[in-house]
């Protein structure tokens, strides 16, 4: 059918609560495109009727709520004027009883469900709520070990729980709860978060400095091999992660099938005041779909990108 297949990472979700996934693949979805969702390679698209428990809402697929039997591979097909991309998303649904300690922990926790607070600093946790505009999210409540969090050190601000003067006792199991309203019906969203404490300066300490790249484009011929370094300076005691991402996904996950684009092994040089880190991204073969796409180097809260660009035609050759 001429569609290029892209495989996204697995999403592990909790049953009996709302879930939504947005089909975005910049720069493809930034232009005039149509997006259609399917389940398990079915030829019949997911319903667009808003009363349906599972339906498409603009570019999103929305489950109100998610149920045990909804596990499977979902495809969203993005059709542009001259292109077609099929994105595969593997959704795994599990039963999780946040306050039942007899039931094991979460399988394969993603970063959204594992968060860090920095000892002795003012820091915050985030309640990740990704839903389309049609979903109105109500007040958020925070719990620790199943008790609602109260006290001077804690402030619920938007989707965050601000924690002042973090102490070792702040580690543990948290949950954030929000009420979601859609078409007059109310649903409860409950996200569990495992919080660990670090003594080292990270977020809230110094900000890593990305020396290269500098948010620029690189001219590169189609089909060539390309290696780009991300050079970062940071404090010696930092806990920041450095990585390359595309479409907000680690490149190694994004290109998991083809392994055409890979992140290299990080190296560092130690100076008296700081460390200089280098982590590269390798394009084994530059393809057409790589052009115009921001490849982001992340270092803690700092980001910088490169965009591949076709070289301008050399008219001297004609």
């Amino acid at each position: 059918d001429g569609c290029k297949d892209i495989f996204m990472k697995n999403e592990i979700l909790s049953a009996s609560q709302p879930f939504a996934f947005n089909c975005t693949f910049p720069p493809i979805t930034s232009g005039e495109v149509s997006v259609t969702w399917y389940k398990n390679s079915s030829k019949i698209p997911v319903s667009k009727i808003i009363q349906s428990r599972i339906h498409q809402d603009e570019t999103w697929i929305l489950f109100l709520p998610m149920e045990w039997g909804d596990s499977g591979v979902y495809q969203c097909v993005i059709k542009g004027r001259d292109s077609c991309h099929r994105i595969h998303v593997n959704l795994t649904v599990f039963e999780k009883h946040w306050c039942d300690t007899s039931i094991g922990g979460l399988p394969n926790l993603s970063d959204e469900y594992k968060q860090i607070l920095h000892l002795g600093k003012d820091d915050s946790l985030t309640c990740h709520l990704h839903f389309p505009k049609s979903c109105v999210l109500g007040p958020i409540k925070w719990y620790k070990d199943c008790n609602e969090i109260k006290g001077e050190r804690f402030t619920v601000l938007e989707t965050r729980l601000l924690v002042s003067n973090v102490s070792a006792e702040d580690r543990g199991n948290y949950a954030c709860q929000a009420i979601l309203t859609h078409s007059g019906k109310q649903y409860e969203v409950l996200n569990g978060i495992t919080v660990s404490i670090t003594e080292r300066a990270g977020y809230g300490g110094s900000v890593p400095k990305i020396i290269y790249p500098k948010n620029h484009s690189i001219e590169v011929q189609l089909g060539t091999t390309l290696i780009v370094d991300c050079n970062v300076t940071d404090t010696k005691d930092n806990t920041n992660l450095r990585c390359w991402r595309v479409n907000n996904t680690l490149v190694d996950d994004y290109y998991d099938e083809s392994k055409r684009i890979r992140e290299g092994v990080e190296t560092h040089v130690s100076f008296r005041e700081h460390n200089l880190y280098t982590v590269n991204i390798t394009f084994l073969e530059v393809k057409m779909e790589d052009y115009g796409l921001p490849f982001m180097c992340h270092a803690g809260v700092s980001t910088a990108y490169i965009i591949l660009q076709l070289p301008a035609p050399d008219f001297r050759a004609y």
Partner: antibody
Framework: QVQLVQSGAEVKKPGASVKVSCKAS????????MNWVRQAPRQGLEWMGM????????RLNQKFKDRVTMTRDTSTSTVYMELSSLRSEDTAVYYC?????????????WGQGTLVTVSS | DIVMTQTPLSLSVTPGQPASISCRSS???????????FYWYLHKPGQPPQLLIY???NLASGVPDRFSGSGSGTDFTLKISRVEAEDVGVYYC?????????FGGGTKVEIK
């Protein structure tokens, strides 16, 4: 639609207190922080603090922690901000403000402002 | 406290011409959750302030699309593609990454 209506202008003597009210309508009063921001003549905007009607939770700018009290009357959906030990530099327009939504910050809704003049 | 520093202090613009205001924060406002807790407001004489941009680059409801916000974790820019007479006032940047919430000193925009 969301509306915040504040009490009228006040003239006070140094050392006195002033209590400014902010009556909310068009939304669930107990779901949102009410923020207070002031602007003194020829000065910028200054955040004084915020008050949550559920549980009477107050978070103050340290600059005002000894002089500001925030309270509410749930029956009339009104929040009050009292500033004590007034001095001439407290002459300002005082605004109450509410965020865009419960999950998106930024003050999308503002009261019309209350001018407080401190003069002997 | 996070300090917000705005430049320039004032700006005189010809109608129809572009304008740009800068703001720098003393700490990165880009959170681990990928949200940048940065805002732009316009305060017109005799009115309460008006939210223009939220979370660095999102246009607030009812704000004309001639306004746009961009930036990094610490350096931010508000651009007006074509200034109109109604755009006069004092522009403020603000952060709500952490308490206390803080504002920049303001940039006064007037029409030539």
């Amino acid at each position: 639609q969301v509306q915040l209506v504040q009490s009228g202008a006040e003239v006070k003597k140094p050392g006195a207190s002033v209590k400014v009210s902010c009556k909310a309508s068009g939304y669930t009063f107990t779901n949102y922080w009410m923020n207070w921001v002031r602007q003194a003549p020829r000065q910028g905007l200054e955040w004084m603090g915020m008050f949550h009607p559920t549980g009477d939770v107050t978070r103050l700018n340290q600059k005002f922690k000894d002089r500001v009290t925030m309270t509410r009357d749930t029956s009339t959906s009104t929040v009050y901000m009292e500033l004590s030990s007034l001095r001439s530099e407290d002459t300002a327009v005082y605004y109450c403000a509410r965020t865009t939504s419960m999950i998106i910050g930024g003050f999308a809704y503002w009261g019309q402002g209350t001018l407080v003049t401190v003069s002997s | 406290d996070i300090v917000m520093t705005q430049t320039p202090l004032s700006l005189s613009v010809t109608p129809g011409q572009p304008a740009s205001i800068s703001c720098r924060s003393s700490k990165s406002l880009l959170h681990r959750n990928a949200i940048t807790y940065f805002y732009w407001y316009l305060h017109k004489p005799g009115q309460p302030p008006q939210l223009l941009i939220y979370q660095m680059s999102n246009l607030a409801s009812g704000v004309p699309d001639r306004f746009s916000g961009s930036g990094s974790g610490t350096d931010f820019t508000l651009k007006i593609s074509r200034v109109e007479a109604e755009d006069v006032g004092v522009y403020y940047c603000a952060q709500n990454l952490e308490l206390p919430l803080t504002f920049g000193g303001g940039t006064k925009v007037e029409i030539k």
